[in-house]
């Protein structure tokens, strides 16, 4: 498919910068996420594991911006082989994680 | 806080031209996809164009095909809409919109629209 | 080409819950938003990715999509509710709306 441009990959880092910068509480009341696998379709794998957090406002931008980089409808209860489902994780970690490989990613310039 | 001002709209006659401009603010211009959405006096709503971002990918609705040019200027913060051969039919209010990010940002919905610059196509 | 389809008119009394369907041909397969415009105004997003509010719309609006058919749910209707409301779906390239439906609140 087509690949995510440099600004918008730049604008979503900024948003998990910004969300991992303003985090007083624990994120989304310390909800737990499943892993994902960072090697393939890290976009839709992340909103996979996302979408199932509701009521947590920090995170919706993320989950909103992170459908522009994935080309299929993601519904809360799906999954794929893209999540790790023996692993889950504090929303607060997973945005961390996803963070550090996303700037790797950019700074690798391939988006 | 994110802004859009349409301007250019005015009365013009069938067959003619009208480039509609949207002057933007409050966020990364070029990082995000622009659409042009009108509505006819009475009328529903109806998509016209979009711009993708940076990506550079445009669409158009089959109403406006060959006749409308969508554009922008990242360094100007500005959407165009260049619209030839102009109809009866295309008199409406024009809003400019922002839409969302990536290559599939149709997906993130339509957030902020501007207040619409009005078209008359009339003789 | 696509079409999204919804009942023209919606009556609701004040404090009661309003419905708004849009039908489309595998719509659930897709993302479905919710425009609300009033008279004179632009339209505001009401609901993106089927069910999910934008920060600052009230919780008394909701919606679903499934199947063929997106519905828009206003609980508790206020007069303030009174307006157009307008479906939305990307389908072959090309954004689509609704027909639009005009609710009006009653009393």
């Known amino acids: 498919g087509p690949v995510p441009p440099y600004t918008a990959l730049k604008e979503l880092i900024e948003e998990l910068v910004n969300i991992t910068q303003n985090q007083k509480a624990p994120l989304c009341n310390g909800s737990m996420v499943w892993s994902i696998n960072m090697t393939a379709g890290v976009y839709c794998a992340a909103l996979e594991s996302l979408i199932n957090v509701s009521g947590c406002s920090a995170i919706e931008k993320t989950q909103r911006m992170l459908s522009g980089f994935c080309p299929h409808k993601v519904s809360a209860g799906q999954f794929s082989s893209l999540l790790v489902r023996d692993t889950k994780i504090e929303v607060a970690q997973f945005v961390k994680d996803l963070l550090r490989h996303l700037r790797k990613l950019f700074h690798q310039g391939t988006f | 806080e994110v802004q859009l001002l349409e301007s250019g709209g005015g009365l013009v006659q069938p067959g003619g031209s009208l480039r509609l401009s949207c002057a933007a603010s409050?966020?990364?211009?070029?990082?995000?996809?622009m659409s042009w959405v009108r509505q006819a006096p009475g009328k529903g709503l109806e998509w016209v164009s979009a711009?993708?971002?940076?990506?550079?990918?445009?669409y158009y609705a089959d109403s406006v095909k060959g006749r409308f040019t969508i554009s922008r200027d990242n360094s100007k913060n500005t959407l165009y809409l260049q619209m030839n051969s102009l109809r009866a039919e295309d008199t409406a209010v024009y809003y400019c919109?922002?839409?969302?990010?990536?290559?599939?940002?149709?997906?993130?919905?339509?957030?902020?629209w501007g207040q619409g610059t009005t078209v008359t196509v009339s003789s | 080409s696509y079409e999204l389809t919804q009942p023209p008119s919606v009556s609701v009394s004040p404090g009661q819950t309003a419905s708004i369907t849009c039908s489309g041909d595998k719509l659930g397969d897709k993302y479905a938003c919710w425009f609300q415009q009033k008279p004179g105004q632009s339209p505001v997003l009401v609901i993106y990715h089927d069910s999910k509010r934008p920060s600052g719309i009230p919780e008394r609006f909701s919606g679903s999509n499934s199947g063929d058919t997106a519905t828009l749910t206003i609980s508790g209707t206020q007069a303030m509710d009174e307006a157009d409301y307008y479906c939305?779906?990307?389908?072959?390239?090309?954004?689509?709306f609704g027909t639009g439906t005009k609710v009006t609140v009653l009393g």
């Open positions: 919109v922002q839409d969302g990010l990536g290559p599939y940002f149709y997906n993130y919905g339509m957030d902020v």
């Open positions: 939305q779906a990307w389908d072959s390239s090309t954004y689509v």
């Open positions: 409050g966020f990364t211009f070029s990082s995000y996809a």
């Open positions: 711009f993708s971002g940076s990506g550079g990918s445009t």
